[in-house]
């Protein structure tokens, strides 16, 4: 039977969703809500989810929040910051998504899927 599926496919789905968000953005994303900036290093997926999970009532990023949960081993709830490490800068959700997208594209190009 076919061998294991490379995890690159899941990362590509996440990237495509972030691309979709940035391209379809008309009004300010999530009404200009602010979220904590994160270090795009180890534990990035959980940190990104912990930051974005605090944005409620924004349907545009609900699928992204849900997708990120599949890359984070533990349950993430609003107000939880165990993976964020440093919380000193807030940025708009739109900028957060752009930064995350650029980093994930870099990881994808480098073949770093986990």
């Amino acid at each position: 039977s076919p061998g294991p599926v490379p995890p690159s496919t899941a990362l590509r789905e996440l990237i495509e969703e972030l691309v979709n968000i940035t391209q379809n953005q008309k009004a300010p994303l999530c009404n200009g809500s602010m979220v904590w900036s994160i270090n795009l290093t180890a534990g990035m997926y959980c940190a990104a989810l912990e930051s974005l999970i605090n944005v409620s009532g924004c349907s545009a990023i609900e699928k992204t929040q849900r997708m990120l949960s599949g890359f984070c081993p533990h349950k993430v709830s609003a107000g939880q910051f165990s993976s964020l490490h440093v919380r000193d800068t807030k940025i708009e959700v739109a900028q957060f998504v752009k930064d995350l997208l650029l980093h994930l594209k870099k990881l994808f190009r480098e073949g770093r899927f986990n």
Epitope: P4, T9, R12, E13, M67, S69, G70
Partner: antibody
Framework: EVQLLESGGGLVQPGGSLRLSCAAS????????MSWVRQAPGKGLEWVSA????????YYADSVKGRFTISRDNSKNTLYLQMNSLRAEDTAVYYC????????????????WGQGTTVTVSS | SYELTQPPSVSVSPGQTASITCSGD??????TCWFQQKPGQSPVLVIY???KRPSGIPERFSGSNSGDTATLTISGTQAMDEADYYC?????????FGTGTKVTVLG
């Protein structure tokens, strides 16, 4: 539109074998984990097995471990469940379910269910 | 093995609130989903991540999860909400479904 279509169900004698198939369409099949869930007549839902999308890992309920084998062919967008040593208690409607993304796919929520295929184990 | 326990049945009058509980050891530490199943139909996801509604699910469905108990609440219950409801969580490399609750809308 995301669609899952199960086939392969039928009547089989105890100790017999059956292979279920699930044809998927409308999404990037290889990216997503997939599960089989069953429901015996008049009973509740019981998860049977899962096949992750990101690492090729497989998972089984204790009740079917060693008898059932889950597999997938991403080139055909198809999920399979090979059922051996069938017992009367395996009689149920078997649902194919789209699971989540990533190594922790189980955090996602079972979004899409097929219509189910009926397996009857009886002599 | 991990178990999720639900009341077998819940009755509610139209327009009233129905609450279904799902109990399991330290369930609040896990993501919980809820499924609705009507007779002869496949289950439908109504709540994921404890309290999130998939698109197309009415606002009257809400969820919460803390401690050992997750709760599905149907506010302003309608006749069309009559169905079986199942909670679900992941534990030790297996999915676990709750025992199921039949919601009956009176009248």
């Amino acid at each position: 539109e995301v669609q899952l279509l199960e086939s392969g169900g039928g009547l089989v004698q105890p100790g017999g074998s059956l292979r279920l198939s699930c044809a998927a369409s409308g999404f990037t099949f290889s990216s997503y984990a997939m599960s089989w869930v069953r429901q015996a007549p008049g009973k509740g839902l019981e998860w049977v097995s899962a096949f992750s999308g990101s690492g090729g890992s497989t998972y089984y309920a204790d009740s079917v471990k060693g008898r059932f084998t889950i597999s997938r062919d991403n080139s055909k967008n198809t999920l399979y469940l090979q059922m051996n040593s069938l017992r009367a208690e395996d009689t149920a409607v078997y649902y194919c379910v789209q699971d989540g993304l990533g190594p922790y796919f189980y955090n996602y929520g079972m979004d899409v269910w097929g219509q189910g295929t009926t397996v009857t184990v009886s002599s | 093995s991990y178990e999720l326990t639900q009341p077998p049945s819940v009755s509610v009058s139209p327009g009233q609130t129905a609450s279904i509980t799902c109990s399991g050891d330290k369930l609040g530490d896990k993501y919980t989903c809820w499924f609705q199943q009507k007779p002869g139909q496949s289950p439908v996801l109504v709540i994921y991540h404890d309290s999130k509604r998939p698109s197309g699910i009415p606002e009257r469905f809400s969820g919460s999860n803390s401690g050992d108990t997750a709760t599905l609440t149907i506010s302003g219950t309608q006749a069309m909400d009559e169905a079986d409801y199942y909670c679900q969580a992941w534990d030790s490399s297996t999915y676990v479904f709750g025992t199921g609750t039949k919601v009956t809308v009176l009248g």
